[in-house]
């Protein structure tokens, strides 16, 4: 019956929420076979390499990290995907030329404290928000 | 003097915060000449197209929208870039093969209410968070 069919579909949704779209695309991995899933990558940034050594006193650099990787169907739990990202993934499967995959972006960012010279050559200690990537997800 | 040079650099930072890196790379527009800047794009999603019409009663679809576009140097104010995204853009300029550009992702998401059948065919009204893209930015 329609009622039991709905129950079955709903159960499928709970256990593998994205299988509803599996029927629509055989393979979306054409250009991403070598790519890993969205995750945090380690990155140390030297302020000298950015050309900022003359105004930033300390630190000399910091562990900024970055996010990279695929947000491909199906989005696993560890990808910290928003509801919109899940919907967008399904729409991308149907219309890859029109709608991109969700992108791998920071979900948690930390601040760092920087000692620097201001316009008047005063030494300032300032906390800069959203400087360090702590976690990544599909957005 | 070093002091006046710092003042000048600091002034440059204030007025055009990313010019500090302009000295290091002439062009990063190798693969993005035709792409527009990161922004919100309109997208209506039909639940029937997702194969969800049997369990979602209402609405029939909704304006989900999505984010797309380049997060290239220099990141303008309207790109809602985080401090980390600004740093990442500069690192990408120097090492494009190692660090990607920041990605264009939702910065504001809204909820929608959905009327649907649960596992037991009960009709449920539920608010789903982070379903609609209201604004995009470089992250």
């Amino acid at each position: 019956s329609a009622s039991s069919r709905r129950r079955q579909q709903s159960r499928n949704r709970s256990t593998q929420s994205q299988d509803v779209a599996r029927v629509s695309s055989a393979s979306d991995y054409n250009s991403s076979e070598l790519k890993t899933a969205c995750r945090k990558h380690e990155l140390y940034v030297s302020f000298q390499d950015l050309g900022w050594q003359d105004w930033i006193i300390a630190p000399k650099g910091y562990a900024a990290n970055y996010c990279d990787g695929e947000c491909s169907f199906p989005l696993n739990a560890h990808m910290n995907a928003t509801n919109h990202a899940i919907v967008q993934t399904l729409v991308h499967l149907m219309n890859p030329e029109y709608v991109p995959k969700p992108c791998c972006a920071p979900t948690k960012l930390n601040a760092i404290s920087v000692l620097y010279f201001d316009d008047n050559s005063n030494v300032i200690l300032k906390k800069y928000r959203n400087m360090v990537v702590r976690a990544c997800g599909c957005h | 003097s070093a002091s006046s040079r710092r003042r000048q650099q600091s002034r440059n930072r204030s007025t055009q915060s990313q010019d500090v890196a302009r000295v290091s790379s002439a062009s990063d527009y190798n693969s993005s000449e035709l792409k527009t800047a990161c922004r919100k794009h309109e997208l209506y999603v039909s639940f029937q197209d997702l194969g969800w019409q049997d369990w979602i009663i209402a609405p029939k679809g909704y304006a989900a929208n999505y984010c797309d576009g380049e997060c290239s140097f220099p990141l303008n104010a309207h790109m809602n870039a985080t401090n980390h995204a600004i740093v990442q853009t500069l690192v990408h300029l120097m090492n494009p093969e190692y660090v990607p550009k920041p990605c264009c992702a939702p910065t504001k998401l809204n909820a929608i209410s959905v009327l649907y059948f649960d596992d037991n065919s009960n009709v449920i009204l539920k608010k789903y968070r982070n379903m609609v893209v209201r604004a995009c930015g470089c992250h």
Epitope: S32, D49 | S24, S27, P96, E97
Partner: antibody
Framework: EVQLVESGGGLVQPGGSLRLSCAAS????????MSWVRQAPGKGLEWVSA????????YYTDSVKGRFTMSRDNSKNTLYLQMNSLRAEDTAVYYC???????????WGQGTLVTVSS | EIVLTQSPGTLSLSPGEGATLSCRAS???????LAWYQQKPGQAPRLLIY???SRATGIPDRFSGSGSGTDFTLTISRLEPEDFVVYYC?????????FGGGTKVEIK
């Protein structure tokens, strides 16, 4: 010891295609970006293309965009340059080179000669 | 695109003499991303200097680099017979990676 060995060069007619390979050894290939650089006979060095460690991002000099495709097979520690619609001005020795993060090209392969002539 | 101009095109000197090779950028570049290479006939280029002034592994101390902004210099303090080859500067801070046209150091 880090080693890069190019192969696949040869004589090809204008409009033809050629695929160059670069076999890498002595380092964790997938962790490094790689580039192709060419040198026309008696001329200077010209960067051609670059690829990220995963192969996900590629970059090209303007004169080869749409004609050349750079790729890599990390399971085989091999770099490739697929060259289509070849022109006389593509005649050169093609070198592959490793580019560590924040660093210049080091080392380079010995090069392979590509001659485009009718 | 950053254009690198090397001068002179050819430098005629005698063994034991010092050589000064110039590399000028079309716009200011970070010294962190300026390199020098040596190329012997029939061989691949070899990295000499990176970060404008740091010697690569195994490079003799007669080779030194300096400069900032738009003007960079490679100095060879005392020319040995094997130094009479071609030298290139390179900007490697982002694509396109550009090379200078080269300076040939020849025996006078």
């Amino acid at each position: 010891e880090v080693q890069l060995v190019e192969s696949g060069g040869g004589l090809v007619q204008p409009g033809g295609s050629l695929r160059l390979s670069c076999a890498a050894s002595g380092f964790t290939f997938s962790s490094y970006a790689m580039s192709w650089v060419r040198q026309a006979p008696g001329k200077g060095l010209e960067w051609v293309s670059a690829i990220s460690g995963s192969g996900g991002r590629t970059y090209y000099t303007d004169s080869v965009k749409g004609r050349f495709t750079m790729s890599r097979d990390n399971s085989k520690n091999t770099l490739y340059l697929q060259m289509n619609s070849l022109r006389a001005e593509d005649t050169a020795v093609y070198y592959c080179a490793k580019r560590p993060y924040n660093s210049p090209f080091d080392p380079w392969g010995q090069g392979t000669l590509v001659t485009v002539s009718s | 695109e950053i254009v690198l101009t090397q001068s002179p095109g050819t430098l005629s000197l005698s063994p034991g003499e010092g050589a000064t090779l110039s590399c000028r950028a079309s716009q200011s570049v970070s010294s962190s991303y300026l390199a020098w290479y040596q190329q012997k006939p029939g061989q691949a280029p070899r990295l000499l200097i990176y970060g404008a002034s740091s010697r690569a592994t195994g490079i003799p101390d007669r080779f030194s680099g300096s400069g900032s902004g738009t003007d960079f210099t490679l100095t060879i303090s005392r020319l040995e017979p094997e130094d009479f080859v071609v030298y290139y500067c390179q900007h490697f801070g982002g694509t396109p990676f550009t090379f200078g046209g080269g300076t040939k150091v020849e025996i006078k």
